[in-house]
């Protein structure tokens, strides 16, 4: 199980001193930025127990493996469900703490109930402040059951849940009708997925026999040990004030674990620390009792004394839970509670024993989970112990589970169970990812998802040219860093594969799938220079350039012209896709803009050195359109145009341009210049009689401006065919007077 503990500090006289701390003993827990370890999360869960909103709670991280929640201002802030989430991937685990108000109408006799599948669970709510009305039981926030207030037995309302199944797990509450939710009794029911003493997918495997109140996990068969106990079967007590799977954590404060509630991963739930009991975990165990919630009885024999934290303390010459075993009885010594091996390895396992008579090689045996008994291949006999060495046949996954070392002599027998975890070496599920490439190197991300077991100790990257039969080159890299493959050939495909390893002998996994990564072309080395440029309009620029002459073929696919508009902070890129090109027309530029211009040769995706830059100023754009253009037929060959000057001119007009076109005609329009810019009238002559014409005009300063509106007018009838339109202009007033 994940080593995750949620501690609640129950100093309820002062809510502001109340805190919740989530502590992880997992390697790399809570780092967050590390790809191998997501952060610890600690929060109030308002989905089921909805209480009035309070001020936001403060979350403080203390190092990488601890997070604390503070900021409770009043007792009602504490009521409800809190959860801590830790562990990575499939081991991600949620630990839940349920807090009851000490002033509630109803109080739980016991908050956490862990039961086996098929058991009958009984939740008991004690009346603290009576109300003469119905009691409503809820399950996970939804109505479940009703009791009349007369149905209390010895001042308690009982909810019996026969034949419970895992879906019955959750938060239960007992509430008086019409009473505040803060007055409810809240419970947590945990239903193991198997019957008593069983675990595994079909509940076919036998639990190791957890001691000292440990609970067998229905998925992996491990004992979840109460706070203050450790070992595969929780057989070993921690020193007072310590907790965690390896007793590595210490209770804060001078009073040790007093006043702390400990919540552990399901199916354990919550309890006081070892040596303490009561709703606020502030009462020491009564004589003869020990352990979490003081649930265990010592029953020491042979002069043993009861310690409320660890149980029986035996006098010399005796050992065992109740000091019931004489030291003459053989005893397994210093057996590790858990061993880890990689699949298909053939490890050696040692088992040491002492006793009187002295154990010999044949008296020590090793039993696998399937019942197979292994005999030792050799034994090392020392004055105080015999160590038997067992050569284990090639391991398979089914060998995972509880193994047992057993010693038998005429003085009696002893056995010690230990857990063997057979781990599958990791195999990449995906190919490595190409990050960047150059002509002679590839930068690769080797971190990929994998099947099998972590942690990843080493990553090997194997690579060789595609379709090559030469040996693979190998580079060993750090799992969390990107790798640069160097000294490669340009424009060459390489087959690249990842191999992952986990710790221990035989931890190397199979190679992952290959991927093809291709190095880039050679970089173009020639630096062009700009020969010249000229403006072909307010938004058009023609550019020409040259390249130095070098022997051999030109390494390049084309040119990239870059125009930098510093004022607007914009760059324009123009791709010239022929390496033979030495000129280009750039259009659609912004009139009146100062550009910095350069050119560079490219090859594949690589750019060569840029030319020295040139600075180009495009002329500004033309003026606005003339206003109120009007056409009036004067004869069968003449039409007079009148207009008003454009507004907001950027400078003096140099001329006007009139466009003349026969309405509906297919031919090109005719443009006529009006070279006297002060004019506001002109006569277009030489038109055809009885013909409809379209006119529009624009002004010019340094460039042509916008067109005016288009006007239509027809010449008068009965005239002869004209030579073609010509223009005569004079001041508008004069024209009109005539």
């Amino acid at each position: 199980a994940v080593d995750l503990t949620l501690l609640a500090n129950l100093r309820l006289t002062d809510p502001q001193r109340f805190f919740l701390t989530c502590v992880s003993g997992e390697a790399g827990a809570g780092r967050g930025s590390d790809a191998w370890g997501p952060p610890l999360l600690l929060e109030k869960d308002d989905r089921i127990v909805r209480t009035p909103p309070g001020p936001p709670l403060r979350l403080a991280r203390n190092g990488s493996h601890q997070v604390t929640l503070r900021g409770f201002s009043k007792p009602s802030d504490l009521v409800g469900v809190f959860s801590c989430v830790g562990g990575a991937g499939a081991r991600r685990t949620r630990v839940i703490y349920v807090h009851n108000s000490p002033g509630a109408h109803l109080l739980p006799d016991k908050v956490t109930h862990t039961v086996n599948k098929g058991d009958t669970a009984v939740l008991s709510a004690r009346v603290h402040k009576e109300k003469q009305t119905d009691v409503i039981w809820k399950s996970n926030g939804s109505y479940f059951y009703t009791l009349d207030w007369h149905e209390a037995q010895d001042g308690r309302f009982l909810l019996q849940l026969p034949n419970v199944q895992p879906p019955s797990s959750g938060i239960y509450s007992a509430t008086y009708l019409e009473a505040s939710p803060l007055g409810s009794a809240f419970f947590r029911l945990i239903v193991r997925g198997c019957g008593a003493g069983r675990w595994g997918p079909g509940c076919t495997k036998e639990c190791p026999g957890c001691l000292h109140g440990g609970v067998c996990h229905d998925h992996d068969g491990e004992c979840v040990c109460p706070p203050g106990f450790t070992g595969t079967r929780c057989e070993q007590a921690c020193r007072e004030g310590r907790f965690g799977q390896s007793c590595q954590e210490q209770c804060p404060g001078i009073s040790g674990c007093r006043g702390l509630t400990f919540c552990l991963p399901d199916p354990y739930g919550c309890s006081c620390g070892s040596g303490w009991r009561g709703s606020q975990c502030q009462e020491a165990c009564a004589p003869g009792h020990f352990g979490a919630d003081c649930r265990l009885q010592c029953q020491c024999q042979n002069g043993g004394t009861c310690d409320r934290f660890s149980g029986c303390v035996c006098p010399s010459g005796w050992h065992g839970v109740h000091c019931e075993k004489s030291d003459r009885i053989p005893q397994i010594l210093n057996m590790a509670s858990e061993l880890e091996f990689n699949l298909e390895t053939m490890p050696r396992i040692n088992c040491a024993a002492a006793g009187n008579p002295f154990p010999v090689r044949g008296s020590i045996e090793l039993r696998k989970p399937d019942g197979t008994v292994l005999l030792s291949t050799k034994a090392i006999v020392e004055p105080e112990k015999t160590t038997a060495e067992f050569e284990v046949p090639r391991l398979v996954l089914a060998d995972s589970g509880f193994w047992e070392c057993r010693v038998s002599t005429s003085g009696g027998q002893d056995s010690r169970r230990f857990k063997v975890n057979v781990k599958v070496p990791p195999v990449p599920l995906a190919a490595p990812r190409l990050l960047t490439k150059q002509s002679r190197q590839l930068v690769v991300s080797p971190l990929v998802s994998f099947s099998g077991d972590g942690p990843i100790s080493t990553v090997r990257l194997h690579y060789r040219p595609q379709d090559s039969t030469m040996d693979w080159s190998t580079i060993v890299v750090d799992p969390s860093e990107n790798v640069t493959l160097m000294n490669l050939r340009p424009k060459t495909g390489y087959s690249v594969r990842v191999q992952l390893s986990r710790p221990g002998e035989g931890g190397e996994g199979a190679w992952g799938p290959p991927t093809l990564m291709t190095t880039d072309c050679p970089e173009p080395l020639l630096q062009p220079w700009l020969e010249g440029w000229h403006v072909e309009g307010t938004d058009r620029l023609r550019v020409s350039w040259s390249l130095p002459l070098v022997p051999g073929p030109l390494v390049g696919d084309g040119f990239l012209l870059r125009l930098w508009d510093g004022t607007r902070g914009q760059e324009r890129r123009e791709n010239v896709s022929s390496p033979q090109a030495r000129t280009a027309l750039l259009t659609g530029l912004t009139p009146g803009t100062h550009y910095q211009l350069d050119v560079q040769l490219y090859h594949c995706t690589l750019l060569g050195p840029a030319s020295p830059p040139a600075h180009v100023l495009l002329p500004p754009s033309g003026p606005p359109a003339p206003r109120h253009l009007h056409a009036q037929a004067l004869s069968d060959s003449e039409i007079q145009l009148t207009w008003k000057h454009p507004e907001a001119l950027p400078g003096p007009i140099s001329k006007y341009v009139v466009e003349v076109q026969v309405a509906g005609g297919a031919g090109d329009p005719l443009w006529i210049d009006v070279d006297r810019p002060e004019e506001t009238s002109t006569i277009i002559r030489g038109l055809n009689a009885s013909t409809r014409y379209l006119f529009r005009m624009r002004a010019s300063i340094q460039g042509l401006g916008d067109w005016s509106n288009t006007v239509e007018e027809s010449t008068l009838g009965n005239g002869l065919q004209a030579e073609g339109p010509v223009q005569e202009s004079r001041a508008a007033e004069e024209g009109l007077d005539q």
């Epitope: 409503i136 809820k138 007369h150 939710p181």
Partner: antibody, heavy 125, light 108 residues
Framework: EVQLLESGGGLVQPGGSLRLSCAAS????????MLWVRQAPGKGLEWVSS????????SYADSVKGRFTISRDNSKNTLYLQMNSLRAEDTAVYYC??????????????????WGQGTLVTVSS | QSVLTQDPAVSVALGQTVRITCQGD??????ATWYQQKPGQAPVLVIY???NRPSGIPDRFSGSSSGNTGSLTITGAQAEDEADYYC???????????FGGGTKLTVL
């Protein structure tokens, strides 16, 4: 869909007995409080009796206490009302109803949203 | 034993607003629940709690509570609202249920 169907009503002489049944469907019968309410012709509604989910607690209106017995069979999803020593004033349409519970700002409250169509009991000589 | 008291009859013009009241000591501890009953039919829940309507009940029905009095208000009464209206709560002992005597609403 919650459904309640009463049966067992009819004509009975004063001093006689009758047993009403209410068949429930569409919900988990064993989790809910049930009750009988009656309505004499042209009169208002009158609560008769309630029974809690386990059947372990019952309550009665003073007017029927000692004569009527409410019971339930959770395995058959059925509510019963055994009526003894019937009187003319027991003539009424008898409805069975189910308690419902709702959450109002965290406070749990009760109402009776689901009713049967009623069965008529006539006590007359 | 506490009782719930209602006016026997109330009338309202079509489209107008009418208020039906229910008085009793138990209403100091419990909200009134209101039921509508039309001739030959089972009662139908219309208002419960502070002012909650089951689905299907028009929003012209509303409830309120003050002291020992619960009220049912119909804003813009319709012809189909003509029916008997009953209030209900627990009695002060918490075990018995009480129904008011009913109010016959006529829509003119």
């Amino acid at each position: 869909e919650v459904q309640l169907l009463e049966s067992g009503g009819g004509l009975v002489q004063p001093g006689g007995s009758l047993r009403l049944s209410c068949a429930a469907s569409g919900f988990t019968f064993s989790q809910y409080k049930m009750l009988w309410v009656r309505q004499a012709p042209g009169k208002g509604l009158e609560w008769v009796s309630s029974i809690y989910p386990s059947g372990g607690w019952t309550s009665y209106a003073d007017s029927v206490k000692g004569r009527f017995t409410i019971s339930r069979d959770n395995s058959k999803n059925t509510l019963y009302l055994q009526m003894n020593s019937l009187r003319a004033e027991d003539t009424a349409v008898y409805y069975c109803a189910r308690a419902s519970y709702y959450d109002s700002g965290g406070y749990y409250r009760e109402n009776f949203q689901f009713w049967g169509q009623g069965t008529l009991v006539t006590v007359s000589s | 034993q506490s009782v719930l008291t209602q006016d026997p009859a109330v009338s309202v013009a079509l489209g107008q607003t009418v208020r039906i009241t229910c008085q009793g000591d138990s209403l100091r501890s419990y909200y009134a629940t209101w039921y509508q009953q039309k001739p030959g039919q089972a009662p139908v829940l219309v208002i419960y709690g502070e002012n909650n309507r089951p689905s299907g009940i028009p929003d012209r029905f509303s409830g309120s509570s003050s002291g020992n009095t619960g009220s049912l208000t119909i804003t813009g009464a319709q012809a189909e609202d003509e029916a008997d209206y009953y209030c209900n709560s627990r009695d002060t002992s918490g075990s018995h249920l009480l129904f008011g005597g009913g109010t016959k609403l006529t829509v003119l």
